[in-house]
């Protein structure tokens, strides 16, 4: 029976030319993680495997790097970057997990900026 | 004045499929994200999903994943949102609803479509 | 999927009244960057649900100054400091920091 539950970063509305950090935890199971994929909608952004290490998706090498810990830093971020994204945990022996995370990225003049881009 | 205005009504039979449509008016139709909102009869609002017209992304609430399918059409500034294999269950009012921008919120809604599931 | 209960489910009021409306979540609503995704909207009778309150306490465009939202984490309350006729109908909380958005169950505002 598969117990465990994924915690995320949360959704996260970020600003076009900054970076953020996406981030997934695994608890409540002693599962053993083989692997973790990063995915946005149908495109693998990047592999951590647990003996093999990280494989960045070669599209995405100048704009994502690996970490902190199982997570992705997304660097230098543009409009186009706005979408789900996924944290895929393949575990042994519950199986695969899977957490979700909804980036919005804002283009600096929007008005309707979270409170981290209001100029005081 | 932003706007968004739903087709009309809908009385289909079980089995089949709809397409509910939702014209935008007033804003950057691509500048934003479009949500969908069922409300069942007296029951409470549940989001089934959103698109994003720049980059045309989708995000589906799972429960509703095998259930609607979102488009959209930018030429006609205008969201579709399919309802498949319908059932009882499906009836209900379906609202879209542009995304306010940096706070994963909606802030302007249209006049709601009634689906109505009867053999 | 992240639960949002909302009490009470009805509130019978007069005219003038203040009143609170309770939202609680399953787990925190703040991300990673100390953001707090929680809104509040009213569904009059025969009208299209609107958008009262945005990230916990910003007012909407045009919302009067008595509505006011406050909390933080798990808790949130939608307090209307007089209620006047326009103000019954449905409210609801939807919380739109996990994946999937989900609403609270609506507090509905009634005469007594």
């Known amino acids: 029976m598969m117990t465990g539950t994924i915690e995320t970063t949360g959704n996260i509305s970020a600003e076009k030319g900054g970076s953020i950090i996406l981030q997934c935890h695994l608890s409540s199971t002693t599962a053993q993680v083989t692997q973790v994929n990063w995915e946005q909608q149908d495109q693998l952004l990047a592999i951590c495997n647990a003996d093999l290490g990280w494989h960045i998706s070669p599209s995405f090498k100048d704009r994502v790097a690996p970490g902190p810990g199982l997570g992705l830093t997304l660097q230098s971020l543009t409009v186009n970057d706005t979408g789900e994204y996924f944290c895929i945990y393949h575990t042994y022996p519950d199986g695969t997990y899977t957490g979700r995370i909804f980036l919005e990225v804002l283009e600096s003049s929007v008005a309707e900026h979270g409170a981290r881009f209001q100029i005081p | 004045e932003v706007q968004l205005q739903q087709s009309g009504p809908e009385l289909v039979k079980p089995g089949a499929s709809v397409k509910i449509s939702c014209k935008a008016s007033?804003?950057?139709?691509?500048?934003?994200?479009m949500n969908w909102v069922k409300q069942s009869h007296g029951k409470n609002l549940e989001w089934i999903g959103l698109?994003?017209?720049?980059?045309?992304?989708?995000s589906y609430n799972q429960k509703f994943k095998d259930k609607a399918s979102l488009t959209f059409d930018k030429s006609s500034s205008t969201a579709y949102m399919e309802l498949l294999s319908l059932t009882s269950e499906d009836s209900a009012v379906y609202y879209c609803?542009?995304?306010?921008?940096?706070?994963?919120?909606?802030?302007?809604w249209g006049q709601g479509t009634s689906v109505t599931v009867s053999s | 999927d992240v639960v949002v209960t909302q009490t009470p489910l009805s509130l019978p009021v007069s005219f003038g009244d203040q009143v609170s409306i309770s939202c609680k979540s399953s787990?925190?609503?703040?991300?990673?960057?100390?953001?707090?995704?929680l809104s509040w909207y009213l569904h009059k009778p025969g009208q299209s649900p609107q958008l009262l309150i945005y990230?916990?306490?910003n007012r909407f465009s045009g919302v009067p100054d008595r509505f006011s939202g406050s909390g933080s984490g798990t808790n949130f309350t939608l307090k209307i400091s007089t209620i006047k006729p326009e103000d019954l109908g449905v409210y609801s909380c939807?919380?739109?920091?996990?994946?999937?958005?989900?609403f609270g169950g609506g507090t509905k505002l009634e005469i007594k």
């Open positions: 609803a542009r995304g306010f921008r940096g706070y994963f919120a909606v802030d302007y």
């Open positions: 007033g804003y950057s139709f691509t500048g934003y994200t």
């Open positions: 698109i994003i017209p720049y980059n045309g992304g989708t």
């Open positions: 787990q925190s609503l703040t991300n990673s960057y100390g953001d707090t995704y």
């Open positions: 990230g916990i306490s």
């Open positions: 939807l919380q739109g920091t996990h994946q999937p958005w989900t």
